[in-house]
């Protein structure tokens, strides 16, 4: 899709397996033409996406794309769940696909569950 609309490049049904206690950066890649849009993160609670107000965020600029980053320093068990970024552009709200974080409690490295073990534990989201 090549246009001057704002585009948010989060893959549909993307997933991340992360460890509680570690730092993690959740990126929202943003493409825009002229003025950088106002971007926010929210966390899904059922069908409602609750805006994350008091969380550390930052921008990372690259040549053809910018990244609006949500920082987890450190990751906490209740960071489990699905997140979405949204951009305000010319009074339009553009929403990304949601991306899901599967958080596991701290274990020794040899005991860390694999990505597939994480994917098989949907109860971790609740």
């Amino acid at each position: 899709k090549e246009s001057c609309d704002v585009q948010l490049y989060i893959k549909r049904q993307s997933e991340h397996s992360i460890l509680a206690g570690d730092p993690f950066e959740l990126e929202c890649p943003v493409k825009y033409c002229a003025n950088r849009p106002h971007v926010t993160w929210c966390k899904l609670n059922g069908t409602t996406c609750v805006k994350l107000e008091d969380r550390q965020t930052s921008w990372k600029e690259e040549k053809n794309i910018s990244f609006f980053i949500l920082h987890f320093e450190p990751v906490l068990p209740n960071d489990n769940g699905s997140y979405r970024c949204s951009a305000n552009f010319q009074s339009n709200l553009i929403e990304s696909h949601s991306t899901t974080l599967y958080v596991t409690d701290v274990k020794s490295a040899s005991e860390r569950p694999s990505k597939d073990e994480m994917a098989s534990r949907p109860w971790l989201l609740y």
């Epitope: 899709k1 585009q7 989060i10 893959k11 549909r12 991340h16 397996s17 696909h97 990505k115 994917a119």
Partner: antibody
Framework: QVQLQESGPGLVKPSGTLSLTCAAS????????MYWVRQPPGKGLEWIGR????????RYNPSFKSRATISADKSKNQASLKLSSVTAADTAVYYC????????????WGQGTLVTVSS | DIQMTQSPSSLSASVGDRVTITCRSS???????????LNWLQQKPGKAPKRLIY???KLDSGVPSRFSGSGSGTDFTLTISSLQPEDFATYYC?????????FGQGTKLEIK
């Protein structure tokens, strides 16, 4: 345009491991999902699993239990499938495919590789 | 797993005919984003499948306009408005809403 090229042995012994590679061109695989589907001779299509090459996160069809492993190498722009403990029932044409992870704007399949499981 | 059921399993038709293939899913394919991830594939003997339609009704690039898709929820349809000789093939529906992805059993379209 997006193209896929599969490679791997066409004959695998029972109880052995089937290994296939799928090289992509015309797209950066980190922007895609890559998946594997198989088709036994004269039968329908069966989804094996997929990978997000950007972070290595995989999803599998539970019917393959723990026998399937899908991996990706971003530097080589390719994905791989390993299927362990194969039997004659695993004889099939194996297809890799790739689709746009953001807008589903393309979905391209490889030419397929017939893998026969026989001693 | 979502079961995908196609009908008919096979179909004989003539060039110029209008043909309809149906696909029913065992549960709704409507995703949380309000879209149904239902695809149609065409497969010719000895060849790889090729996607014709995605998101129920969107035609892939280069697919002739005689192909169309419709439906919602659990019931979907592929229609070929005027069969051409190159359309004789096997057609599969498959869903991309939930894991694992699942396919219909296929509909073989043969020349009458």
């Amino acid at each position: 345009q997006v193209q896929l090229q599969e490679s791997g042995p066409g004959l695998v012994k029972p109880s052995g491991t089937l290994s296939l590679t799928c090289a992509a061109s015309g797209v950066n695989i980190k922007d895609t999902y890559m998946y594997w589907v198989r088709q036994p001779p004269g039968k329908g299509l069966e989804w094996i699993g997929r990978i997000d090459p950007a972070n290595g996160y995989t999803r599998y069809n539970p019917s393959f239990k723990s026998r399937a492993t899908i991996s990706a190498d971003k530097s080589k722009n390719q994905a791989s499938l390993k299927l362990s403990s194969v039997t004659a029932a695993d004889t099939a044409v194996y297809y890799c495919a790739v689709y746009d992870g953001y807008y589903e704007s393309f979905d391209v399949w490889g030419q397929g590789t017939l893998v026969t499981v026989s001693s | 797993d979502i079961q995908m059921t196609q009908s008919p399993s096979s179909l004989s038709a003539s060039v110029g005919d209008r043909v309809t293939i149906t696909c029913r899913s065992s549960q709704s394919l409507l995703d949380s984003d309000g879209k149904s991830y239902l695809n149609w594939l065409q497969q010719k003997p000895g060849k790889a499948p090729k996607r014709l339609i995605y998101l129920v009704s969107k035609l892939d690039s280069g697919v002739p306009s005689r192909f169309s898709g419709s439906g919602s929820g659990t019931d979907f349809t592929l229609t070929i408005s005027s069969l051409q000789p190159e359309d004789f093939a096997t057609y599969y529906c498959w869903q991309g809403t939930l894991f694992p992805r699942t396919f219909g059993q296929g509909t073989k379209l043969e020349i009458k």
